[in-house]
């Protein structure tokens, strides 16, 4: 029987700014039962607090709701793990809110065909910003990435759509049934999670471009 | 105890291509960006650029972009920083360096001198 | 790219004395998100840089006390109440509110 392993606060998420999670990863337990407690401090603070919030963000996770959650202000953090025999710190972790965003997917995605008598066909795309970001404060850039496939492919082609929400694809095989999916990040942030598939079936006369090529 | 431990000194070429390294330990690789910055002799200090390990998203410095190559190799927690076509202005100690969930940098790698010369 | 001016180039200080450090920035730090992303950095002789200060005037962890950082907008400083041997080196500030991150020129200082 020995004192708790050292724990490791490994990942902080926001949807959003206004709230956030830290999760930390348990040491070994010293084969005894082990309590854990995380504790932080705000930058120009020297007032230690206790970790408001240990359900919300499920085992070993610590949740900040609304009124503990201040973007301009640094946290600093650490998490004590306490068994019979003794305890171990965490390494201090700082955390910046606007450096761990993980926005919500973007929403309503709409797929067309668009074949414009005087040019080649194109897929059209567009989608809105996830409800939850607040892109008018300037405080988020979100960049957005397309994925595609026909049904029954097993490989996803990728683009890069930066900061547009629109999108046009050239090249696409005639009579396919295609999957189109965005996600979002802000700069800094993390990737969302893939919007729900929308499927879009590409007509038998659709001309297929020599080069394979999209235009934003 | 978090460890950057960078790869050992390299002589190259001009047009020549370098790749150096960044072993990290002592936490979770994939959770914090890793930055690449470079110190010229009796020089300041530039920055490179960033990537997130978790998913290889990058972001450059204009004056880099095109030249410089990062990437990670996530199974060894390893960060590469690749530079082509040397010229002996590129002659500087690099140095990685890993942030926390911030944009400012706590951990240095080492460094690792790169000479370029002919 | 945001330019970072320090002055001055070097520093020689008699230990026990304050030592003073400013940095000017070619545009404002203050970030879109209201923060100020300055920080100072040290680099002893032979030595990767550590870091002193981060955003603007918060002490790292196991900085001592005697090393504050103040400023706003474009002007910042870095004090040293009381010069100790262990302190020589090059000192760095660095701003990371815009991209390409940037550094400061660097200020030596040293021990008279």
């Known amino acids: 029987q020995l004192p708790p392993g050292k724990p490791e606060i490994f990942k902080c998420r926001s949807p959003n700014k206004e709230t956030f999670t830290c999760w930390w990863r348990p040491g070994t337990d010293g084969g005894l039962p082990t309590n854990y407690s995380l504790t932080y401090h705000r930058e120009g603070e020297t007032l230690m607090h206790e970790c408001p919030d240990y359900i919300t963000g499920g085992p070993n996770s610590c949740h900040f709701g609304k009124q503990y959650t201040s973007m301009w202000r640094t946290y600093v953090m650490m998490v004590n793990a306490t068994n019979q025999m003794g305890s171990s710190f965490s390494d201090e972790l700082y955390v910046d809110v606007t450096y761990i965003v993980q926005p919500d997917p973007p929403l309503e995605l709409t797929v067309e065909v668009k074949q414009p008598e005087d040019r080649k066909p194109y897929l059209w795309m567009k989608w809105s910003p996830p409800t939850l970001i607040d892109l008018k404060t300037g405080w988020f850039t979100l960049l957005y990435e397309i994925r595609l496939k026909p049904e029954k492919a097993a490989e996803w082609e990728t683009h890069f759509a930066g900061q547009q929400t629109e999108f046009k694809i050239l090249s696409l095989h005639p009579g396919q049934k295609y999957l189109v999916q965005v996600r979002c990040k802000p700069d800094h942030g993390y990737w969302s999670a893939w919007s729900p598939a929308t499927f879009i079936q590409i007509p038998s006369d659709f001309i297929m471009n020599d080069h394979h090529h999209h235009h934003h | 105890e978090v460890q950057l431990v960078q790869s050992g000194a390299e002589v190259k070429k001009p047009g020549s291509s370098v790749k150096v390294s960044c072993k990290a330990s002592?936490?979770?690789?994939?959770?914090?960006?890793i930055h690449w910055v470079r110190q010229a002799p009796g020089q300041g200090l530039e920055w490179i650029g960033e990537i997130d390990p978790s998913d290889s998203y990058t972001n450059y410095n204009q004056k880099f972009k095109g030249r410089a190559t990062l990437t990670v190799d996530r199974s060894s927690s390893t960060a590469y920083m690749e530079l082509s076509s040397l010229r002996s202005e590129d002659t500087a100690v690099y140095y990685c360096?890993?942030?926390?969930?911030?944009?400012?940098?706590?951990?240095w790698g080492q460094g690792t001198l790169v000479t370029v010369s002919s | 790219d945001v330019v970072m001016t320090q002055t001055p180039l070097s520093l020689s200080v008699t230990p026990g004395q304050p030592a003073s450090i400013s940095c000017r920035s070619s545009q404002s730090l203050v970030h879109s998100n209201g923060n100020t992303y300055l920080h100072w950095y040290l680099q002893k002789p032979g030595q990767s840089p550590q870091l002193l200060i981060y955003k603007v005037s918060n002490r790292f962890s196991g900085v001592p006390d005697r090393f504050s950082g103040s400023g706003s907008g474009t002007d910042f400083t870095l004090k040293i109440s009381r010069v100790e041997a262990e302190d020589v080196g090059v000192y760095f500030c660095s701003q990371s509110t815009h991209v390409p991150f940037t550094f400061g020129g660097g200020t030596k200082v040293e021990i008279k």
């Open positions: 002592g936490y979770t690789f994939t959770s914090y960006w």
């Open positions: 360096g890993r942030s926390f969930f911030t944009n400012w940098f706590a951990y």
